[in-house]
């Protein structure tokens, strides 16, 4: 039969410039001598010869004089190859081919890697920065391999995904320089971190920059928003109220108004230098232009969706700046529950029945309560499941398992905790024997 040749299943990871050992072994039979051995290492794809041993002699490297065998270990079946001063171009599959009487071969993968340098950060512009200014932050990391993954996040660790452009260029040695550019609208201040990950080494290199915009000697702008969340029904329009107190002589040319998502800093809507810059949020936002000069910076959000739920920051900059966050709580009423009974005929006292209460397209998740005809809560043997659809709206199904008495009414109440809206349905089971639904 064929000769069994063993190599590692996982790729051999080697740092650029270091030496790597591509392990390969076979089991020599008793009485084996090296004169019987033919050993060939070759590139799997191109069949290019890398190193060979034949007729009892090391035939040497055919691969830039950077390979060597372990001659003292060959007789014990160690056919491993030493590859020196690893380069990016070495990456790939190497086949170890062993022939004595029979022959066998196996391929081992070499994965080359090089760590990325600590990123350097540049900020443009880097002076006279004000809230509302757009800045470009460039994160550069050098001489890594393979291509990096780049992540941006703010000071709270929240990922920043919008307006990121990353480019990677290989040099003559095949090592990559990575440049990632984040374009961001400045808030009151902020820390921006760039993380460059080598996916093979699982090595993270990171740097951050903290930007504190210029403040005016005349003091901050006071920005007012409602303390309580704004509750909006799915599909309707919502007004996120925000106001400031304009000074005498204030003109809109002086105003920088920015609405952004509090967590991700994603721009929602802006007004700068006397002009409404429009919606950056699916064209569903609008300001109240006629009211801006009086200090009304409120935002109209149209056709509210579940995904809109969260905190929005209203950022006002005139001479100085101020900001405040308003929460949007999205809600949708639940439909009147439909009730089903199983089994629904030939029912007798003592039978166990399953009553299902279903209510649809509500938000947020519902609270479900069961009670009997006297209003006594039924808590045992209730299973409630809620599933969100593509729009994020929930369908709720609650199952009550109950042993029938002589007769009884079972009510299901589906409560929307935000709207404090209760939708209920009930089923009355009477008679003996009973059928459901009652026959006309």
């Amino acid at each position: 039969g064929a000769l069994e040749v063993q190599v590692p299943e996982d790729p051999v990871v080697a740092l650029v410039g270091t030496d790597a050992t591509l392990c390969c072994s076979f089991s020599p039979e008793p009485g084996f001598s090296l004169a019987q051995l033919n050993l060939i290492w070759q590139l799997t794809d191109t069949k290019q010869l890398v190193h060979s041993f034949a007729e009892g002699q090391d035939q040497g490297s055919a691969y830039a004089n950077r390979t060597a065998l372990f001659p003292d270990l060959l007789a014990q079946g160690n056919a491993s190859l030493r590859l020196q001063r690893v380069r990016v171009a070495d990456e790939g599959s190497f086949t170890c081919f062993v022939s004595i009487r029979d022959f066998g071969s196996a391929a081992v993968s070499l994965q080359v890697a090089a760590p990325y340098s600590k990123p350097s950060m540049t900020l443009e512009p880097n002076k006279d920065l004000r809230p509302g200014d757009t800045v470009t932050i460039t994160c550069s990391s050098y001489q890594g391999y393979p291509e990096a993954e780049v992540f941006w996040q703010d000071g709270q660790g929240v990922p920043l995904t919008g307006n990121v452009t990353t480019s990677q260029m290989a040099n003559e040695q095949g090592l990559f320089d990575v440049h990632s550019i984040l374009r961001v609208v400045l808030g009151a201040n902020g820390t921006y971190s760039c993380l460059v990950r080598n996916p093979v080494l699982q090595q993270d290199a990171h740097s951050s920059v903290t930007i504190t915009p210029q403040r005016s000697p005349t003091g901050a702008v006071e920005v007012q928003v409602p303390e309580d969340p704004v509750v909006a029904l799915v599909g309707t329009d919502a007004t996120l109220r925000c106001s400031f107190s304009p000074e005498p002589g204030f003109s809109l040319a002086q105003l920088n108004l920015i609405w952004q998502l509090t967590d991700t800093k994603q721009l929602v809507h802006s007004f700068t230098e006397g002009r409404d810059q429009g919606s950056a949020y699916a064209n569903r936002t609008a300001l109240f232009p006629d009211l801006l000069a009086q200090g009304n910076a409120s935002l109209r959000l149209q056709r509210v969706r579940v995904a809109d739920e969260g905190s929005f920051t209203c950022f006002v900059s005139i001479r100085d700046f101020g900001s405040a966050a308003v929460s949007l709580q999205v809600a949708a009423p639940y439909s009147k529950p439909s009730m089903t009974l199983e089994p629904n005929k030939d029912l007798r006292p003592g039978d166990t029945v399953t009553i299902t209460c279903s209510s649809y397209r509500g938000y947020p998740e519902a609270e479900v309560f069961w009670q009997d005809g006297q209003g006594v809560p039924l808590t045992g043997n209730v299973t409630t499941s809620q599933m969100a659809n593509e729009q994020g709206l929930f369908d709720v199904h609650s199952v009550l398992r109950v042993v029938l008495g002589a007769n009884g009414t079972y009510s299901c109440l589906v409560r929307n905790p935000v709207l404090q809206q209760d939708a209920h349905g009930s089923v009355t089971i009477t008679g003996q024997p009973m059928t459901f639904p009652p026959e006309a």
């Epitope: 443009e124 512009p125 002076k127 006279d128 004000r130 005016s216 000697p217 002589g249 040319a253 230098e273």
Partner: antibody
Framework: EVQLVQSGAEVKKPGSSVKVSCKAS????????MNWVKQRPGQCLEWIGR????????RYNQNFRDKARLTVDKSSSTAYMELSSLRSEDTAVYYC?????????WGQGTTVTVSS | DIQMTQSPSSLSASVGDRVTITCRTS??????LAWYQQKPGKSPKLLIY???TLEEGVPSRFRGSGSGTHFTLTISSLQPEDFATYFC?????????FGCGTKVEIK
Amino acid sequence: EVQLVQSGAEVKKPGSSVKVSCKASGYTFTAYWMNWVKQRPGQCLEWIGRIDPYDSETRYNQNFRDKARLTVDKSSSTAYMELSSLRSEDTAVYYCARGVRIFDYWGQGTTVTVSS
Amino acid sequence: DIQMTQSPSSLSASVGDRVTITCRTSENIDYTLAWYQQKPGKSPKLLIYNANTLEEGVPSRFRGSGSGTHFTLTISSLQPEDFATYFCKQAYDVPRTFGCGTKVEIK
């Protein structure tokens, strides 16, 4: 090193148009607005307008809205200003300058002479 | 538009003199004023921004002050290379507007 290099001097006939270029190097072109400023001998500097190379958003001085058109070519990091319907009062040195509030780097200036 | 009034329009001074140039604005611009220096045949060069912040590489003999509507540029000890024209510019509003310049000449 940041540099703004403008195209050479132009002599034009009244009624014609001229396109002045400003090639930027040494910084991220899309990170700074590019402004254009007019200077006539013995007169005040006049701000013509500016363009954001990132998305080509423009802001014009109303006095130049029908005179100047600002564009950019991101691939070559070059900003352009085209002046149309030239008249003798358009004879001036035109500068490009980068920035929003502060103009920290300026081109060397392009002299446009309008003469019949 | 915000009007910029610079004075004097020209002045003669000697090396070592203390020179003060004034810029007034038609409305409150807080501190958003910059000063530029221009030599004949050259483009303007930024000296000071935010009324009093010295641009990198600009000698400390240049000093800006003021806020609101009244600003000054002071050269504490005039040097031969300082003979030039100086402009103020407001950055509070669009359009940006410039003063018409103060020419500092050798006495």
